[in-house]
């Protein structure tokens, strides 16, 4: 088989026939050096998954539940292309599983026990697997058989397709539990009707169900959605209040050597020639000899899944949790109100050492998880491998786009009620050597720059955002002659000045000596012309405050700030000479962990925070020899956010807009993946 062949897996005679037609029609429109199709027939989707894993086939299209199976070891497949529905302008690749209730019913998600439930059908995604999977650990024991446990949890249900003889309570609201539209409460519309008629208290459906059944907004306003954080929201706020976000239909391939670019090239050309309303003789999204053959008949086209996205991220934490609960059937010994240990994400081995010491001292409250980059840490928090970390504002933005929430803010100024008063922020500055007296904000072109890291606030987003407004392009590596911006592409001129050895060169973690505030300042001291840091960086590393050999003899007076008006000022005049105000670093977590992270961190800072005076004989949470490990070393406390509890509110409109403008210059693969899930 030539290298540019995609071996498509078919699961029936009809699919194999359509696959052969797909192959022949593609041959007729694609040049001989382009991608081609070969067909492999297997007896089932699971056989197809195994065949792809074994390199006997390359691709198959799967529903969400099977994407989960495909991802599990030893298959290790990943999503590569998504079908979309709706229009090209507003493509829908996901639907939302929701819990709909009547507005005046007054209960929350954690109060569903004893209520009456309406389901689309037994074993169906939005109507059964997701809600029951998420409620699984609240079900009464024994949880097997599952139908019995569910019957004992709700006071009555309509779950079409259930066995009404063995589990009569599941058919209480729809006698007979008929498994077709003959049952008025079957399917999405039926489950909603079950709620609407007053038979049930909650309907488990998808987000579009209520819009399809109630055209009138006034009627829709009589209903609400139950959110997982035990609040309610209007039905049109389903993106912020759902049980799970579920991909509709997805092409999967091997994670390694999976031909994902070739598969995309093939399907992209296929949709150009044989997509919706393109060709009479062969239609990709039509199944004359059946239904949904190879692809869903209702699909409108394909979108490439960002390469950073693995199956866990694609399916989302809630969906994976629900399906894993159902499949594995394991729950904590006894559900208690106690918080589980918080799994802190540590960057590289230096942070891990500090985290380990914290973990030992925390007596079971803190566990540690390692990752090599901040984005890897954010991804681990998203999928539940980790729970929390403290982030620079630039990464709070990315984490927010990925569905995480800020929970506490670092405060840097001593005050009487530090924990109750989140600060306005710190100043992002541009520092130069006093001796380079001709250097101003207006003549930085061709100079050598030092950055904390790509994507961080003071070191990147603010200065590069301002620069972008001036030069109107993203080629910052051409603007500066060379520099160190950890996280840049290794062959970029913005890695040239970096000092990390071997694979650590230009890495966005402490293995790169010029990483972070202190690192960027060191880069200026030793090699650079300008450093983009925070206003406290120079005083924190001069006058003997940093004992490291490179810093111990530095004098604050030898450095100046660049002001945006083209003038320069002494370092202590940062309030009148800065690039912008930056939001303080903040701790982020998943929404489901928010309360526990808040509680445990407040306990931890009372034990190990800035009230500890002797850090040589005690563990100090906010100290790491000027290296800002886990938290900034100048943190005085972690402060409550009050109502600034979303990334937009926390960062502020101005900063969110500034980072949004820089998005076109973004190299963040994680941001790309997260905006695919939520544009």
């Amino acid at each position: 088989v030539p290298d540019k062949t995609v071996r498509w897996c078919a699961v029936s005679e009809h699919e194999a026939t359509k696959c052969q037609s797909f192959r022949d029609h593609m041959k007729s429109v694609i040049p001989s050096d382009g991608p081609s199709v070969a067909c492999v027939k297997k007896a089932s989707y699971l056989d197809c998954i195994r065949a792809i894993a074994a390199n006997e086939a390359d691709a198959v299209t799967l529903d969400a539940g099977l994407v989960y199976d495909a991802y599990l070891a030893p298959n290790n497949l990943k999503p590569v292309v998504a079908e979309f529905y709706g229009s090209k302008e507003d493509p829908q690749t996901f639907y939302y599983a929701v819990a709909v209730v009547k507005k005046d019913s007054g209960f929350q998600m954690n109060q569903l026990r004893g209520k009456k439930s309406c389901h689309t059908g037994l074993g169906r995604s939005a109507g059964w697997n997701i809600p029951i999977g998420l409620l699984y650990c609240d079900l009464p024991e024994p949880r097997k058989p599952l139908e019995k446990a569910v019957a004992n949890f709700f006071s009555g249900s309509c779950a079409p397709c259930a066995d009404g003889t063995d589990f009569p309570q599941l058919c209480q609201l729809c006698p007979g539990c008929g498994c077709s539209t003959l049952n008025q409460y079957f399917g999405y519309s039926g489950a909603f009707k079950c709620l609407k008629d007053g038979a049930g208290d909650v309907a488990f459906v998808k987000h579009s169900t209520i819009f399809e059944n109630l055209a009138n907004k006034a009627d829709r306003d009589q209903y609400e959605l139950l959110c997982l954080d035990n609040t309610r929201k209007p039905v049109d706020e389903y993106k912020d209040c759902h049980l799970a976000q579920v991909p509709s239909h997805t092409v999967v391939a091997r994670s390694m050597g999976g031909k994902e670019d070739l598969i995309w090239e093939l399907l992209n050309q296929a949709q150009e020639h044989f997509g919706k309303d393109k060709s009479k003789e062969f239609q990709l999204f039509s199944s004359p000899h059946g239904k949904d053959l190879l692809f869903k008949d209702s699909a409108h086209g394909f979108l490439k899944v960002p390469p950073r996205m693995d199956a866990k991220m694609y399916l989302g934490y809630e969906y994976v949790t629900a399906i894993r609960n159902l499949r594995e059937g394991t729950c904590p010994e006894a559900p208690t109100d106690e918080c589980k240990p918080v799994k802190w994400c540590a960057l590289s081995h230096h942070e891990r050492l500090k985290c380990d010491e914290w973990s030992v001292n925390s007596v079971g409250k803190i566990e540690c998880v390692s990752a090599e980059t901040t984005e890897d840490c954010i991804a681990k928090i998203m999928n539940g491998e980790a729970d929390a970390m403290s982030l620079d504002g630039g990464f709070v933005y990315i984490a927010g786009k990925c569905g995480l929430v800020p929970v506490l803010a670092e405060n840097y100024n001593k005050s009487d009620n530090c924990e109750d008063t989140p600060e306005a922020g710190y100043f992002a500055i541009a520092v130069v050597k006093k001796s380079a007296s001709d250097l101003t904000w207006d003549n930085l072109k061709g100079k050598k720059s030092c950055h904390t890291a790509v994507g961080r606030t003071a070191g990147w987003n603010i200065p590069m955002g301002l620069l972008y407004n001036k030069i109107n392009h993203c080629r910052f590596d051409e603007f500066f002659s060379e520099g160190c911006a950890p996280g840049s592409k290794k062959d970029s001129s913005l890695c040239k000045l970096c000092m990390g050895s071997g694979l650590n060169l230009c890495e966005p973690n402490n293995k790169e000596g010029y990483y972070g505030y202190t690192g960027a300042f060191r880069c200026l001291v030793e090699k650079g012309d300008v450093a983009f840091v925070k206003h406290q960086t120079v005083p924190q590393n001069t006058g003997g405050k940093n004992p490291d050999p490179w810093a111990k003899n530095l004098n604050e007076k030898d450095y100046e700030l660049l002001c945006l008006d083209g003038t320069r000022k002494p370092v202590e005049e940062y309030a009148n000479c800065h690039l912008a105000r930056a939001p303080n670093h903040a701790v982020v977590t998943r929404k489901d962990k928010e309360a526990c992270v808040h509680k445990i961190l407040r306990q931890q800072q009372h034990l190990f925070g800035s009230n500890v005076t002797d850090c040589s004989g005690n563990f100090c949470l906010f100290r790491s020899e000027t290296k800002d490990l886990l938290f900034r070393d100048d943190t005085v406390c972690l402060a409550k956010l009050h109502d600034r509890n979303t990334y937009e509110k926390y960062l502020g409109e101005e900063y969110v807009k500034a980072v949004g403008n820089l998005r076109k210059c973004s190299t963040s693969s994680l941001l790309e993946a997260c905006t695919f899930r939520r544009p």
Epitope: K354, E357, N361, S616, G617, S624, K627, L629
Partner: nanobody
Framework: QVQLVESGGGLVQPGGSLRLSCAAS????????MAWYRQAPGQQRELVAG???????KYADSVKGRFTISRDNAKNTLYLQMNSLKPEDTAVYYC???????????WGQGTQVTVSS
Amino acid sequence: QVQLVESGGGLVQPGGSLRLSCAASGSIASINTMAWYRQAPGQQRELVAGITRGGSTKYADSVKGRFTISRDNAKNTLYLQMNSLKPEDTAVYYCTDYSRGYYQDYWGQGTQVTVSS
């Protein structure tokens, strides 16, 4: 800063026991946290067990119930009692007191533990 020297490693059969010692060149009474780490070939160094001055302990999940960490401040020594050893416990074991900071990579020679039949 005190110097730390590990000893007590060796070759042992699966199911066997070893007791590692870490002798400090000075007083450990004022040192808050001490810990044992291990590093297997091609792996990251990982925390095995830690102990605070007050006697609170923490163990990696993989060694819970098999290993016991203790310290004797009078003898300025940290110990790791290792029971029911498994082949996957094979590694070089290091002790640390974190006093050199998290940034400098000062680790002693360590002591090799090999579990094999």
